[in-house]
Structures are given as structure tokens and as C-alpha cells.
């Protein structure tokens, strides 16, 4: 043999119970001591430090802390140094060294030692990762190193978590003993944070110890808080909230059309939209993700805004008799009431549509003029004016005439035409044609589609000539002999030629 000792490097005991520290030692056979003595020291192996004597086989003298509480269970002659400590209290926690005393100069303190830990709670061992939906084994372990008092285990707060299975007394690697009870169950997300307890009691004593472990159940996110569809007025502030329940907290991401708008590891994430525009109208998605899974939900944002200024497309110039088609369109939310007016008269209207088609079959000159397309919803009204130009051959109006006054004859030729006609006055009796370009004789004035040309003849009062007005444009020409109005006409009627 050789000098050596074997004892557990650590051992535990419940406060108030006892602990048996298993210990064996060896020494060279040739020493052949008649009697083997031994000493157990507390916390220091150096006798010079005067460590508390826990047990000494040669005498009954021990440190006051160990008085009546220490006893050798082993037989030193059989190289067994097992120590029993009774009614252990926290101050007994520490290192225990054995010193063999074989007589003569052969006292040997073994460097191997045992660290005693005085505990008052059972040790609940939960696997490092507990995932919802996956079976888990939770164990309750308590030291069982007191031959006089054996612990009994029971679970607390395990209702609905399955029936415990008692494994019983198990020997650990270094010769210490534990009492073990197992609990098998499939945790749910609701079990997260649940306090599971284990109680160790000692029959025929009042000793009772409880330990608790909070379940840290990992589970995938579920989005639990989300706006329903949101309506917002253009320019207003919009907050979209997404809240998820998961463990660990999820990575929350707000997205729109595949673009990440905001993300954070949090239980809830607010997406703030300042002064929303119609461009931000659409579907927003919240994605919640952790290592155990993901969830996503969408919310529609509807940005409400007044109609944009309508745009008008179509034929703005038409020939009399043609069919004209004009499209008025706008954008708004909600869709507007669209109306086309002409001179305060409603020509066409649609409700909650973004475009309005105006059909004018066989347009006439009366259709020529200014039109308005008006778009309106509860947020506002916008209008666009447009002109329809109806082109037609000249029409000489009935108010065309000649009139004499003293020595002057004035002839009015009133023409309605589009485009503007060229007007000529013909005096057949004189074989003369006067064009509107001859400013000293002709004055023209246009009002809308009506052109009034005035021919002034001086010194013609006594014998007014025949005057023929001809109006011409690309669609045709019309002529009219202008009638004389007033006294001369009547006079002529009396006198005759």
C-alpha cells in the first residue's frame, strides 16, 4: 500500500439531518501499526493552524461546534475513516480533512478532502431547453447521506403535469447517495413561468424542505395583438401595433410589399406613419419569428383622401353630326361622385366610381362650349373645365340685315360657324365684293361662335344697293341677300323703281 485516501470531493446534507462522509485510507503495509488512530479536521489540513478538531480517536476532545455531533462510523483498523455528523447546521459547511495517526512519526494528513454543503432546498433539475409540445423529464434530487433519516419526496404544483415516478435511492459517482423522483410531461405554452415544487420530508420528524423551479417553456410566436383594418385621412398620423406571445421574445418585423419597414426583438412593435399619403395605402404584414417557429398577420391600411383634380381625355374638337366620347377620371378614397356639367346642367353622373364616360351622339353646334367634370367625396371636391369645339358649316342668322340712316347704310351679316368663317359682302349692282379685310368698310366682331360683320356704305341712302353676305369655312359656304329694315324699306315699297 501507499499513503492515500478516498472520499467524495463534495457531499450534501439537509440542515438538521445528519451526514455520513464515506472515507477509506491506505498506508504502507510495513508500518504495521498496533493501533491506528485518526483525526478529522475542519477547513484546514495544517495542525499548526489549530483547525477545529471534528473527531479524534485518541481522545474525546473535539471543538465545541462538533461536541456530541461527530462519530466515527468506520473502523480505522480496517482503514475505514467514515465520519458521521449529526444535527448539521450551516456553520458545519466546509472542508473536512482526515489525518491518519499510526504512531511514531507516522501522522499523515491526506490532501484528499470532502466539502460538505448544508442545504435547505431540494434540487429541481429542469433540462436546459424545455419546448412546448415536446415531452420533458424534470427531476427532483435530494441528498440521502444520512443513515438515520431517509427523505421522502413529493411534488407540488404538478397537477395536470403527469404522475411522478420515484426512482428511489441512487449512488453517485463518488459514493454519495441521492433520492430521486421524476416527472414526465408534455409542457404547453401556458406552462411557461409555472412554479413547480418538490418537497422533501423526513418521517417522524418535523423536518420539511421545499424547492421550486420556474418552468421556462420555449414556444413559437403567436400574434395576439393586431389592428383590424385601418382607415386614415391623408396627412394624419397612423400607428399600427403588432403584439406577439412567444418565448423567447420574437423578432417582430413590419413589412409592406416585401420591404422591411421596421423590426425589433420585442413582444410588441409599433409602426408609426407620419402624415400618411395615398401611396402608403395597402396591406401591411407583421412577421413574428423565434427559434421555435413563426406567425404572420396582415392589416389593410386605407388612406382616405379628397379626389385628385380630374383628368379629361377624349375628342375636344368634333364635326357636327359626329359622336363625341369624353372620359373624365380621378383618384380618391373613397371613390367619388363624378358629374359632368354644361352650363349648370348635369349631363352625366356616376356614384362611387373613379371614371365617367360622356357620350354625345351626333353633336350639334349647341353642344359646343365649356364643360365641367366635378369629382366629390366627403373629404373634398375638385373640378376640371374642358371645352368641346363643334365644327360646322356657316349658318347666316336671321338677324342679318341692312339699315339706312341719313346718308349711311349699315349692313349686318350675323354668322354662326366653327371654325370662324370668312365673310364677304357682294354688291351685284355695282359688281363689287367687299372682304372683311377691308377695314375702312367692314368691321367684324366675334362673340362665341357668332361672328357679326358690319358693312358701312356712305352716301348710299337715296338708292340703297342689294347686298349679299357670303360666309365660308372649310365645311361650306352660305349666302344671304341682306334684307333692308326700317323707313327706307317701307318708303321703297311705296315708291317702287
Amino acid at each position: 500500500g501507499h499513503w492515500g485516501a478516498w472520499m467524495p470531493s463534495s457531499i450534501s446534507a439537509f440542515e438538521g439531518t445528519c451526514v455520513s462522509i464515506p472515507c477509506r485510507f491506505d498506508f504502507p503495509d510495513e508500518l504495521r501499526p498496533a493501533v491506528v488512530h485518526g483525526v478529522w479536521y475542519f477547513n484546514s489540513p495544517y495542525p499548526k493552524n489549530y483547525p477545529p478538531v471534528v473527531f479524534k480517536s485518541r481522545t474525546q476532545v473535539v471543538h465545541e461546534s462538533f461536541q456530541g455531533r461527530s462519530r466515527l462510523l468506520g473502523d480505522l483498523g480496517l482503514r475505514n475513516c467514515t465520519l458521521l455528523l449529526s444535527n448539521v447546521s450551516p456553520e458545519l459547511g466546509g472542508k473536512y480533512y482526515f489525518r491518519g495517526d499510526l504512531g511514531g512519526y507516522n501522522q499523515y494528513t491526506f490532501s484528499e478532502h470532502s466539502v460538505l454543503d448544508i442545504v435547505n432546498t431540494p434540487n429541481i433539475v429542469v433540462p436546459p431547453e424545455v419546448v412546448a409540445g415536446t415531452e420533458v423529464e424534470v427531476s427532483c434530487m435530494v441528498p440521502d447521506n444520512c443513515p438515520e433519516l431517509r427523505p421522502e419526496l413529493s411534488w407540488l404544483g404538478h397537477e395536470g403535469l403527469g404522475e411522478p415516478a420515484v426512482l428511489g435511492r441512487l449512488r453517485e459517482d463518488e459514493g454519495t447517495w441521492v433520492q430521486v423522483s421524476l416527472l414526465h410531461f408534455v409542457p404547453t405554452r401556458e406552462a411557461n413561468g409555472h412554479r413547480l415544487g418538490c418537497q422533501a420530508s423526513f418521517p417522524n420528524t418535523t423536518l420539511q424542505f421545499e424547492g421550486y423551479a420556474s418552468m421556462d417553456v420555449k414556444y413559437p410566436p403567436v400574434i395576439v395583438e393586431m389592428n383590424s383594418s385601418v382607415e386614415a385621412i391623408e396627412g394624419s398620423h397612423v400607428s399600427l401595433l403588432c403584439g406577439a406571445d412567444s418565448n423567447p421574445p420574437p423578432l417582430l418585423t413590419w413589412m409592406r410589399d416585401g420591404t422591411v419597414l421596421r423590426e425589433a426583438v420585442a413582444e410588441s412593435l409599433l409602426l408609426e406613419l407620419e402624415e400618411v399619403t395615398p401611396a402608403e395605402d395597402g396591406v401591411y404584414a407583421c412577421l413574428a419569428e423565434n427559434a421555435y417557429g413563426q406567425d404572420n398577420r396582415t392589416v389593410g391600411l386605407s388612406v382616405m383622401y379628397a379626389p385628385w383634380k380630374p383628368t379629361v381625355n377624349g375628342t375636344m374638337v368634333a364635326v357636327e353630326g359626329e359622336t363625341v366620347s369624353i372620359l373624365c377620371s380621378t383618384q380618391s378614397n373613397p371613390d367619388p361622385i363624378l358629374t359632368i356639367f354644361k352650363e349648370k346642367q348635369i349631363l352625366s353622373t356616376v356614384i362611387y366610381e373613379s371614371e365617367l364616360q360622356l357620350e354625345l351622339p351626333a353633336v350639334s353646334p349647341e353642344d359646343d362650349g365649356e364643360y365641367w367634370c366635378v369629382a366629390e367625396n366627403q373629404y373634398g371636391q375638385r373640378a376640371t373645365a374642358f371645352n368641346l369645339s363643334v365644327e360646322f358649316a356657316p349658318v347666316l342668322l336671321l338677324e342679318s340685315h341692312c339699315a339706312a340712316a341719313r346718308d349711311t347704310v349699315q349692313c349686318l351679316c350675323v354668322v354662326k360657324s366653327n371654325p370662324e368663317p370668312s365673310v364677304a359682302f357682294e354688291l351685284p349692282s355695282r359688281n363689287v365684293t367687299v372682304n372683311e379685310s377691308e377695314r375702312e368698310f367692314v368691321y367684324s366682331e366675334r362673340s362665341g361662335l357668332v361672328l357679326t360683320s358690319i358693312l358701312t356704305l356712305r352716301g348710299q341712302a337715296q338708292a340703297p344697293p342689294r347686298v349679299i353676305c357670303t360666309a365660308r369655312n372649310l365645311y361650306g359656304a352660305k349666302s344671304l341677300e341682306l334684307p333692308f329694315q326700317g323707313a327706307h324699306r317701307l318708303m321703297w315699297a311705296k315708291i317702287g323703281p
Partner: antibody
Framework: QVQLVQSGSELKKPGASVKVSCKAS????????MNWVRQAPGQGLEWMGW????????TYADDFTGRFVFSLDTSVSTAYLQISSLKAEDTAVYYC???????????????????WGQGTLVTVSS | DIVMTQSPDSLAVSLGERATINCKSS????????????LAWYQQKPGQPPKLLIY???TRESGVPDRFSGSGSGTDFTLTIINLQAEDVAVYYC????????FGQGTKLEIK
């Protein structure tokens, strides 16, 4: 030179106590253990035990437990043997003897007794 | 305890002659860890304390005449004194210091 000088002879009555001293000089006191050896008149040598002068820890031979106490006063390099409840059979010459000690870590090895005191005769008689 | 037995109990040798004293231990005093025999020889003259002559069974203490020698191993040991001198008259003790220390009963050496 190494010297171990013991206190003088003692005549004691049975039941009394006696304290024998052994003063060391010429070496470092705490580097050597101090042994006590008894020699009854006309008899052989009997080892009583020793005291570790470095740690102050005494070790007693099996026949010398109880009434026999080894002690030290390292400040004056002196070892003491105290015998209480003296009996007639305690009459003997008591020797102190040093032994070298080789220290290593928390343990040591003890060697042969090399220097002895001159002895102290303790007579127990009524 | 290890019992040490010396022989003879007494011995008379002429001056200048050789004296041999034997010592037997009840168990080996050879320590396996260092292969040393934990055995010593002492000389004690009347009225004096014992004096160390030999240790480790064969190592002479400084100042001891080389007429003294020790031998043996395990359980059997011998002290030899050659060219015996008058001052060698004494009681000789063997002593083991491996386990709880013990002495032999002593051998008385006289001049013949």
C-alpha cells in the same frame, strides 16, 4: 554546539505532579521534534512519545496516554513533560531527545533521535 | 508494535577483539517508499544518556569511530565492534523508528 539541558532531579509523593523541562540550544528548535524516553532503574529504554515543535501537536505512545502531557514554549526553546497523579512505578530517569524532521507540504517524515538530554531522575516515594 | 529482540543479553570480549551484537525485529523495518531500514544503534554508559552510533542500519553518526559498523536489512541486523577498546564497555540498544518507536532490551558488553 547542540545541547539539551534538563531540569534537576525531583522527589515527589504519590498522587503529586511533576513538570520536567528540556531547554534546547545550538539549533533551530522548531526544525526538530522532541521525544521523551523513560528508563526505569536498571531497565531498558521506553519511548513515551513526541511533540512536533513546529505544529505543537503531541503524539503519545499507547502506554503513556492520560497522565502524561507534552508541551512547549517555543519562545524559550523549551519542551516540557508533565506527569500527574504520580505512582511509585513512575520512578525513573526521563530523557528528552530531538529527532530531525523533513517537512513537505502538509506532511513530514521523522528520523532517528540524534541528541539526548542528560536525563532527569524523578523519584516517587511516600 | 514492532518487538525488537537483541542477542545476547550480555557479552564479554577481550580487548582488541571483535564484538558482535544481533537484533531481530518482529516485522520488517525496511520502508518500501525509500528503501531504507529504519533501525539505529545506541550506546549507553552508566549515568549517561544514550549516544547515537548508527542509523539507517548502517550509516555511522559523525564522530563515531569507524570500529563501529552496522549491517542487515528487513528483520535481521548486526552491530559489529572491531578492535574492542576499554571505553566501549556499555549497554548497546537497537531501536526501530519506522512504526511506533521501540527499543531492544539491551546487550551489556564487558571486557573479558
Amino acid at each position: 554546539q547542540v545541547q539539551l539541558v534538563q531540569s534537576g532531579s525531583e522527589l515527589k509523593k504519590p498522587g503529586a505532579s511533576v513538570k520536567v523541562s528540556c531547554k534546547a540550544s545550538g539549533y533551530t528548535f522548531t526544525n526538530y521534534g522532541m521525544n521523551w524516553v523513560r528508563q526505569a532503574p536498571g531497565q531498558g529504554l521506553e519511548w513515551m512519545g513526541w511533540i512536533n515543535t513546529y505544529t505543537g501537536e503531541p503524539t503519545y505512545a499507547d502506554d503513556f496516554t492520560g497522565r502524561f502531557v507534552f508541551s512547549l514554549d517555543t519562545s524559550v526553546s523549551t519542551a516540557y513533560l508533565q506527569i500527574s497523579s504520580l505512582k511509585a512505578e513512575d520512578t525513573a530517569v526521563y530523557y528528552c531527545a530531538r529527532n530531525p524532521i523533513n517537512y513537505y507540504g502538509i506532511n513530514y517524515e521523522g528520523y532517528v533521535m540524534d541528541y539526548w538530554g542528560q536525563g532527569t531522575l524523578v523519584t516517587v516515594s511516600s | 508494535d514492532i518487538v525488537m529482540t537483541q542477542s545476547p543479553d550480555s557479552l564479554a570480549v577481550s580487548l582488541g577483539e571483535r564484538a558482535t551484537i544481533n537484533c531481530k525485529s518482529s516485522h520488517s523495518v525496511l520502508y518500501s517508499s525509500n528503501q531504507k531500514n529504519y533501525l539505529a544503534w545506541y550506546q549507553q554508559k552508566p549515568g549517561q544518556p544514550p549516544k547515537l552510533l548508527i542509523y539507517w542500519a548502517s550509516t555511522r553518526e559523525s564522530g563515531v569511530p569507524d570500529r563501529f559498523s552496522g549491517s542487515g536489512s528487513g528483520t535481521d541486523f548486526t552491530l559489529t565492534i572491531i578492535n574492542l577498546q576499554a571505553e566501549d564497555v556499555a549497554v548497546y540498544y537497537c531501536h526501530q523508528y519506522l512504526s511506533s518507536l521501540t527499543f531492544g532490551q539491551g546487550t551489556k558488553l564487558e571486557i573479558k
